[in-house]
Amino acid sequence: EEELQMIQPEKLLLVTVGKTATLHCTVTSLLPVGPVLWFRGVGPGRELIYNQKEGHFPRVTTVSDLTKRNNMDFSIRISSITPADVGTYYCVKFRKGSPENVEFKSGPGTEMALGAKPSAPVVLGPAARTTPEHTVSFTCESHGFSPRDITLKWFKNGNELSDFQTNVDPTGQSVAYSIRSTARVVLDPWDVRSQVICEVAHVTLQGDPLRGTANLSEAIRVPPTLEVTQQPMRVGNQVNVTCQVRKFYPQSLQLTWSENGNVCQRETASTLTENKDGTYNWTSWFLVNISDQRDDVVLTCQVKHDGQLAVSKRLALEVTVHQKDQSSDATP
């Protein structure tokens, strides 16, 4: 007969208030004949948690039927866990004795500690938008977890980031902890549709991490590029001039036409289209009345994007019967 071993596989068991805790204990031998009891703590002051033979333990149930002759599983469940239940639990084998049973061997013990799940991570981006090629900071916070050990990772579009700093507070003992992490992200022009993800893994989450997300669309500003062109065909005494505003984000945009420095109040036709990368294109058409007698006309397309300084593009129209495209230049 092999020597009796008392196996308590979990060194630490994290439980949540109100839930049921399962304390595992198996034996490798049925001998010597005698009961297995559960205690919290050691020494003369230890507290009896479960005795199959006698006593009233309303919150304790056994995982297996202990009356079965060949039972080797003495695991128990404790329901409605409270903070008062924390401590180290031992399954202890007794051999039959008289007048009392004699303690024979103890398991190594399982420490029961209260675990608290972290709150859902909240990711905050920068207060103001930034243009591509610049670095922006995102913060991630999660609170109320215990024990202190926690893992936090950052991802951008599924790719793990490495440029971040994380702090867990407080540094000393506490009933609950908080984590704060700041990640530095370099913006790319195509990041309108990108996401940053903060992932928090904790023992209480049983391998199912919590995630917080932020959309880079809230942090990025992609400035437009402008192009003004004159349509080659003339319709009567009107020429169609197009201002193409390309690849901008966000959508907020004001466009005005000027003719020889004078802002034109009349409406122009326009279309807004969205690109696959989430940026926008805006096309505006302006009809210019011309006559053979007029001086040359200089048209300016001015764009104010997302409250930034206006940018403009000029086009000089050559009013001749044989129109041809003129060179254009940009002014800030």
Partner: antibody, heavy 120, light 107 residues
Framework: QVQLVQSGAEVKKPGASVKVSCKAS????????ISWVRQAPGQGLEWMGW????????NYAQKLQGRVTMTTDTSTSTAYMELRSLRSDDTAVYYC?????????????WGRGTLVTVSS | DIQMTQSPSSVSASVGDRVTITCRAS??????LAWYQQKPGKAPKLLIY???NLQSGVPSRFSGSGSGTDFTLTISSLQPEDFATYYC?????????FGGGTKVEIK
């Protein structure tokens, strides 16, 4: 195989002593307790006492206290029951039985019994 | 001491009959009760332990129930080899005590 083999029948005079042996085989002797149970002719079962084959602790029935001694010899896997100052009402079949319950007491293996006759 | 009272002391029955034997403890013994079968000139044989657990090798026509003070042994369909004397035994505490026995006889 797993068994308990008891010593043979005895005839004793009143006032004498008897020592019955019970040899275990086929199992780990030290892992179990042994109880002794007797049965007078035509009567029911009467528990006499228990001994731990591991530690040697004993518990005897009140009415036999002082007259009975139970011992074990782990080297030979044998249990012994000695009854002194025999009386005619001690005439009975004496059984040894392996005690197998973990938190309780029951007997899953019995010897065939030893008849002890006390007669003048 | 815990007294064990068995009833009836004897019962006449035929092969195929359902037989029920009861055992009452003088105080609560949880489920620490065993049932034995004894045939003339033989040692007792364990049938049921811990009130309701069938000992290995015992036919399933034997069953036990009860808890606290009242317990029952049932033979669902009596077979010729079942004619014997049956004892209950409390194993809750020393001194261990047996019931007076129930003799199951052929009708």
């Amino acid at each position: 195989q797993v068994q308990l083999v008891q010593s043979g029948a005895e005839v004793k005079k009143p006032g004498a002593s008897v020592k019955v042996s019970c040899k275990a085989s086929g199992y780990t002797f030290g892992g179990y307790g042994i109880s002794w149970v007797r049965q007078a002719p035509g009567q029911g079962l009467e528990w006499m006492g228990w001994i731990s084959a591991y530690g040697g602790e004993t518990n005897y029935a009140q009415k036999l206290q002082g007259r009975v001694t139970m011992t074990t010899d782990t080297s030979t896997s044998t249990a012994y029951m000695e009854l002194r100052s025999l009386r005619s009402d001690d005439t009975a079949v004496y059984y040894c039985a392996r005690e197998a319950g973990s938190s309780w007491y029951d007997f899953d293996l019995w010897g065939r019994g030893t008849l002890v006759t006390v007669s003048s | 001491d815990i007294q064990m009272t068995q009833s009836p002391s004897s019962v006449s029955a035929s092969v195929g009959d359902r037989v029920t034997i009861t055992c009452r403890a003088s105080q609560g013994i949880s489920s620490w009760l065993a049932w034995y079968q004894q045939k003339p000139g033989k040692a007792p044989k364990l049938l049921i332990y811990a009130a309701s657990n069938l000992q290995s090798g015992v036919p399933s026509r034997f069953s036990g129930s009860g808890s606290g003070t009242d317990f029952t042994l049932t033979i669902s369909s009596l077979q010729p080899e079942d004619f014997a004397t049956y004892y209950c035994q409390q194993g809750a505490s020393f001194p261990i005590t047996f019931g007076g026995g129930t003799k199951v006889e052929i009708k």
